[in-house]
Amino acid sequence: KESCDVQLYIKRQSEHSILAGDPFELECPVKYCANRPHVTWCKLNGTTCVKLEDRQTSWKEEKNISFFILHFEPVLPNDNGSYRCSANFQSNLIESHSTTLYVTDVKSASERPSKDEMASRPWLLYR
């Protein structure tokens, strides 16, 4: 951990319960030394992670760490699912742990699977 390798610090098993219609920022903490790496977000679809090409992203720079932010403005029901950030560094691809968004659609909350259901039946995330 003392090296200058890029580190992505998304927490293992992290999850976020959010409401459709609200704004939300998904942060990927990025530790680097000299040159800021190229970072992207992707959304898991089964075993593949589909790159999010045309979504609004930004950087937040702090003293010892930076955050690559994926903006949801607003959150939509189909934003439900698991996300991962990846960094390209010296020809290496570094991938974070996945983080899961549980989106509640307030208009049809009674029809949607609960967070507990999705935890025990993760395939509901992809239906």
């Epitope: 951990k1 610090y9 293992r12 760490i65 974070s96």
Partner: antibody
């Protein structure tokens, strides 16, 4: 230097709700996960749950039905409510910050702890 | 949940001696999801080691962590008077996060 300070009543009656607040100073509550941990007198540590600054939570299943953790970013505070308390909930309650520089869930800053006694 | 078992419960040693504390998980916690804390009477725990072997900020080099899978070790290479305390391990591989029962390092 980040500092955490727990506050709340030191005595709660059985069946009532325990309410504690943790005030964070010397740093922002943003971009971090925050946690509550407790320690019954003379015993070990038990993780209660965490909250992200955006409001997302995760609770220990053993306490889940009785816990609410909330956050107030404008006051740089987060809070714990534990309902239907019994004598078994008597403990020192700590608030703590989850370390940023890891994908794991270690606690790098702790409050000094507050003893909550459940007794009539 | 993952149960963490620490041994021995009490370790009696003299200043200057080497302390070896053991922590065993009921199932594999990978190679790096293990933390160690020190707690002195009347104080909050203090993070010593995270990611199994990374020293937290300000922690002296005499503290080192090792291990992977289910078996982890905290080593204090030469005990100082201020090191006599209770030490806890914590796994952060699976939620809920769980702690070991602690090892008390006391002066012999």
């Amino acid at each position: 230097q980040v500092q955490l300070q727990e506050s709340g009543p030191g005595l709660v009656k059985p069946s009532e709700t325990l309410s504690l607040t943790c005030t964070v100073s010397g740093g922002s509550i943003s971009s971090y996960y925050w946690s509550w941990i407790r320690q019954p007198p003379g015993k070990g540590l038990e993780w209660i749950g965490y909250i992200y600054y955006s409001g997302s939570t995760n609770y220990n299943p053993s306490l889940k039905s009785r816990i609410t953790i909330s956050v107030d970013t404008s006051k740089n505070q987060f809070s714990l409510k534990l309902s239907s308390v019994t004598a078994a909930d008597t403990a020192v309650y700590y608030c703590a910050r989850v370390i940023l520089y890891s994908s794991g869930w270690s606690f790098d800053y702790w409050g000094q702890g507050t003893l909550v006694t459940v007794s009539s | 949940e993952i149960v963490m078992t620490q041994s021995p419960a009490t370790l009696s040693l003299s200043p200057g001696e080497r302390a070896t504390l053991s922590c065993r998980a009921s199932q594999s916690v990978s190679s790096s999801y293990l933390s160690w804390y020190q707690q002195k009477p009347g104080q909050a725990p203090r993070l010593l080691i995270y990611d199994a072997s990374t020293r937290a900020t300000g922690i002296p080099a005499r503290f080192s962590g090792s291990g992977s899978g289910t078996d982890f070790t905290l080593t204090i290479s030469s005990l100082q008077p201020e090191d006599f305390a209770v030490y806890y391990c914590q796994q952060d591989y699976n939620l809920p996060l769980t702690f070991g029962g602690g090892t008390k390092v006391e002066i012999k």
